[in-house]
Interface confidence: medium
């Protein structure tokens, strides 16, 4: 039975040019994280390895930084990046969590962070 | 260019052991996280290990679990595997392979034959 | 872990011809498939990755597609150092596995 939530950043806005971390967190299990895949619909970004660490797909490896902890830092923001990013846990015995962030890059500096949710 | 050469295989009987090394140049080998990957005879290709680039994370698949163990001695751009408990499946000839990130192999070496066989 | 099923297991093809091989995944990997030629007594040489990004120094006759679960190569015109064994293989998780592999063989 899976039991954990994710809690994420919820929706975010970023100015373009600027950075954003996008940030989960798995929690209300004893599961084993194995991997977790970061992808922006359906390309993935980067994983990081319980075992091997971090890898970074080469086609976003200018601009996608590994961390804080599990999460991801995007850098050099445009307006494509805005759209829909997952967090997917692989954990044993649970099996996979997936947490959604959406993510507006906005070409005015009034860009303000959303309210934190939760995903069960 | 990069270069990758196996080493330390060669004939053994079951319950034996070997230890595999491969000498990596042409690159900065302490950047990159390495992998073995074994192919038995007429064969195709199985995931042995991989350790991280720093030496301080390991995977092993589950057939070599707590026989096979691998390392890696970065300032002598080298890669080990040492290999205990073998048995007669385990004869296949063993890759070792460069990996950019943590799962990614990019470069490969020639191979070196383990035969396990009394 | 993930399985890695590749068809046809063997083909015959005559240089010129088009070469489709396929490979599915057991669960979704996104992009993180990679496509390897192996010829006899030779290391695997990387030819695709992430899916469809072509390796330096491989001909451009070699393309890769897919994502998800199903992913194809494809050889435009098959050359006479393109008869070989092709593999795909997963790097979407540990433990890393590959496909069975796909021998192409002169007709």
């Known amino acids: 039975m899976m039991t954990g939530t994710i809690e994420t950043t919820g929706n975010i806005s970023a100015e373009k040019g600027g950075s954003i971390i996008l940030q989960c967190h798995l929690s209300s299990t004893t599961a084993q994280v194995t991997q977790v895949n970061w992808e922006q619909q359906d390309q993935l970004l980067a994983i990081c390895n319980a075992d091997l660490g971090w890898h970074i797909s080469p086609s976003f490896k200018d601009r996608v930084a590994p961390g804080p902890g599990l999460g991801l830092t995007l850098q050099s923001l445009t307006v494509n990046d805005t759209g829909e990013y997952f967090c997917i846990y692989h954990t044993y015995p649970d099996g996979t969590y997936t947490g959604r962030i959406f993510l507006e890059v906005l070409e005015s500096s009034v860009a303000e962070h959303g309210a934190r949710f939760q995903i069960p | 260019e990069v270069q990758l050469l196996e080493s330390g295989g060669g004939l053994v009987q079951p319950g034996g052991s070997l230890r595999l090394s491969c000498a990596a140049s042409?690159?900065?080998?302490?950047?990159?996280?390495m992998h073995w990957v074994r192919q038995a005879p007429g064969k195709g290709l199985e995931w042995v290990s991989g350790i991280s680039s720093n030496g301080g994370s390991t995977s092993y698949a589950d057939s070599v679990k707590g026989r096979f163990t691998i390392s890696r001695d970065n300032s002598k751009n080298t890669l080990y595997l040492q290999m205990n408990s073998l048995r007669a499946e385990d004869t296949a000839v063993y890759y070792c392979?460069?990996?950019?990130?943590?799962?990614?192999?990019?470069?490969w070496g020639q191979g070196t034959l383990v035969t396990v066989s009394s | 872990d993930i399985q890695m099923t590749q068809s046809p297991s063997s083909l015959s093809a005559s240089v010129g011809d088009r070469v489709t091989i396929t490979c599915r995944a057991s669960q979704s990997i996104s992009s993180y498939l990679n496509w390897y030629q192996q010829k006899p007594g030779k290391a695997p040489k990387l030819l695709i990755y992430?899916?469809?990004s072509l390796q330096s120094g491989v001909p451009s006759r070699f393309s890769g597609s897919g994502s998800g679960t199903d992913f194809t190569l494809t050889i435009s015109s098959l050359q006479p150092e393109d008869f070989a064994t092709y593999y795909c293989q997963q790097s979407y998780s540990t433990p890393l596995t590959f496909g069975g592999g796909t021998k192409v063989e002169i007709k």
């Open positions: 042409g690159f900065t080998f302490s950047s990159y996280a």
């Open positions: 992430a899916a469809s």
């Open positions: 392979a460069r990996a950019p990130y943590s799962v990614w192999i990019d470069y």
